[in-house]
């Protein structure tokens, strides 16, 4: 017997649908109506035929009461080819829901997104996460999607993007965005970061994650942040192959004084990089290739320093830095 495509847990909290049949019974998803967190995986299906069955131009207000009754706070949609018109139709209807977090993964968005009608209500998301989503519209996709969202977005995550650079002149500011995660875009690089960090469009960023993004030096990242006017409190550069030395011809970069936490773990560093901020609350240098204990003059003034998992650290040796957070146990790096 074929397993049920949708499973709702016994607490009405989590509902997961895996539609793998060529002609799935979408009505099965109705059992998710009382779930708080919903995941729908469409098995790579092309949802184009849906456009014939739904009126994408219908006034979504007619569904308002039905949608308001949904408990869903977090929705994940994955593995499908979705016409932009259908995506927009869904966003318009979900604007009447309690949805706060939306994740789109492994999607191919086809066609262009129509402009937001004057009477339409934007979706009041606090978090939007995109992973491996391709858009037919290329660089303008963020601006097109943004118009369907209210301006209160706090968390934006874009991974495995086909076009991580945005059409900055079309993008409006994200006034409430405090966390931007561009991790897992290995082709981004420092020049790409400059293109992605549209100047003055991210005025409230506190946390910036750039894991596995092809960054080369902390100084290069500093320059990109300075150019964009982005002043994060916390910066994650882990899982990049970082060079410790700075190009002598490159101008010195002054880090923002707002930065107090820097993650340089898993960065292949054989020595402490030059050009780090002068003062930090947290510096993570764990799981690098440091062959000797860093000298005080190589390090910023730092409250919490993590050096676990470096070759020079033999379990049980004295901690190399006052106030460090080393456990004395080499983690699995």
């Amino acid at each position: 017997t074929t397993p049920e495509p949708c499973e709702l847990d016994d607490e009405d909290f989590r509902c997961v649908c895996n539609f793998s049949e060529p002609q799935p019974d979408w009505s099965e998803a109705f059992q998710c109506v009382s779930a708080v967190e919903v995941e729908i995986h469409a098995g790579g299906l092309n949802l184009e035929p849906f456009l014939k069955r739904v009126d994408a131009d219908a006034d979504p207000r007619q569904y308002a009461d039905t949608v308001k009754a949904l408990r869903v706070r977090r929705l994940t949609v994955g593995a499908a080819q979705v016409p932009a018109q259908l995506l927009v139709g869904a966003l318009r209807v979900l604007a009447y829901s309690r949805l706060k977090e939306l994740t789109l993964e492994d999607l191919k968005i086809t066609g262009t997104m129509p402009p937001l009608p004057l009477e339409a209500t934007g979706l009041a998301l606090s978090s939007l996460r995109l992973r491996n989503v391709s858009w037919a519209t290329g660089r303008s996709w963020l601006a097109e999607l943004q118009q369907w969202l209210k301006p209160g977005l706090k968390v934006l995550s874009i991974a495995q993007a086909h076009s991580p650079a945005f059409s900055c002149e079309q993008v409006r500011a994200f006034p409430a965005l405090t966390s931007l995660d561009l991790s897992d875009n290995p082709g981004l690089g420092e020049r790409g970061l400059m293109a992605a960090l549209c100047p003055h469009k991210f005025p409230a960023i506190q946390n910036l994650a750039l894991r596995n993004t092809g960054m080369e030096t902390p100084t290069g990242v500093c320059a990109a942040l300075a150019a964009a006017g982005v002043q994060p409190h916390s910066l994650d550069l882990s899982h990049n192959s970082l060079r410790a030395t700075v190009n002598p011809s490159a101008p010195r970069c002054m880090w923002s004084s707002a930065l107090n936490s820097l993650n340089l773990s898993f960065a292949g560093l054989e020595q402490v990089p030059k050009g780090l901020p002068a003062k930090l609350r947290v510096l993570d240098l764990s799981c690098n290739r440091l062959n000797r204990a860093p000298q005080p003059d190589e390090l910023p003034e730092v409250d919490n320093l993590t050096l676990d998992g470096n070759p020079f650290l033999v379990p049980g040796t004295a901690l190399p830095h006052e106030g460090s957070m080393n456990s004395g146990v080499v983690p699995a790096c």
């Epitope: 847990d9 607490e11 009405d12 909290f13 989590r14 109506v33 009382s34 708080v36 967190e37 009754a69 949904l70 408990r71 706070r73 977090r74 309690r98 977090e101 978090s127």
Partner: antibody, heavy 115, light 111 residues
């Protein structure tokens, strides 16, 4: 059998940050459900503080949102509560609880805010 | 926020009596076919214990003298034959919409 156990200091000074940890055994905090903090001031009713879900998503009571952070350590199967800028009004028994119909409770820990 | 108002705030009844506690919500706590209203019993110095979930479902291990009913905004907890061990404070709680809220409690005593 699922068990939850709260731990943390029983006395916190005004204006400081209250920090509690809940250790879960008999179930994984990253596989399902919501993992909540609920408090009860002495002789008063129950107040939901917030949750962190199996996915890492959080939801907070708006009345406390500006002061609350709930986080988790999946490697230790623990979730934690931080409540900043505490006053005497935050004196309460703090419970960690599983689900949104609250079927599994820790035994509770009394936190007193006093100088 | 959804406000839950319990009545009475306290009550005294004799062993064997049928006891009813009501809970009224400021707006509907129904989502489609389910009412997300639950009932708890709390004894002094102990954590609350789930009695009834989704308005009418008896939690495993709870005596069958406890029952629940209601939908949308009006709900009832009934103890068909009061026992001495039922002395406690009873709370209703909604999980239809965050913030998840509790009633103010009903203190039940034996005459």
């Amino acid at each position: 059998q699922l068990q939850l156990q709260e731990s943390g200091p029983g006395l916190v000074k005004p204006s400081e940050t209250l920090s509690l940890t809940c250790t879960v055994s008999g179930g994984s905090i990253s596989s399902d459900s919501a993992w909540n903090w609920i408090r009860q001031p002495p002789g008063k009713g129950l107040e939901w503080i917030g949750y962190i879900s199996y996915s890492g998503s959080t939801s907070y009571n708006p009345s406390l949102k500006s002061r609350v952070t709930i986080s988790r350590d999946t490697s230790k199967n623990q979730f934690s509560l931080k409540l900043s800028s505490v006053t005497a009004a935050d004196t309460a028994v703090y419970y960690c609880v599983r689900g949104l119909r609250f079927a599994y409770w820790g035994q509770g820990t009394l936190v007193t805010v006093s100088s | 926020d959804i406000q839950l108002t319990q009545s009475p705030s306290s009550l005294s009844a004799s062993v064997g009596d049928r006891v009813t506690i009501t809970c009224r919500a400021s707006e509907s706590v129904d989502s489609y076919v389910n009412a997300f209203l639950h009932w708890y019993q709390q004894k002094p110095g102990k954590a609350p214990k789930l009695l009834i979930y989704r308005a009418s479902n008896l939690q495993s291990g709870v005596p069958s003298r406890f029952s629940g009913s209601g939908s949308r905004t009006d709900f009832t907890l009934t103890i068909s034959s009061l026992q001495p061990e039922d002395v406690a404070t009873y709370y209703c709680q909604q999980s239809n919409e965050d913030p998840y809220t509790f009633g103010q409690g009903t203190k039940l005593e034996i005459k």
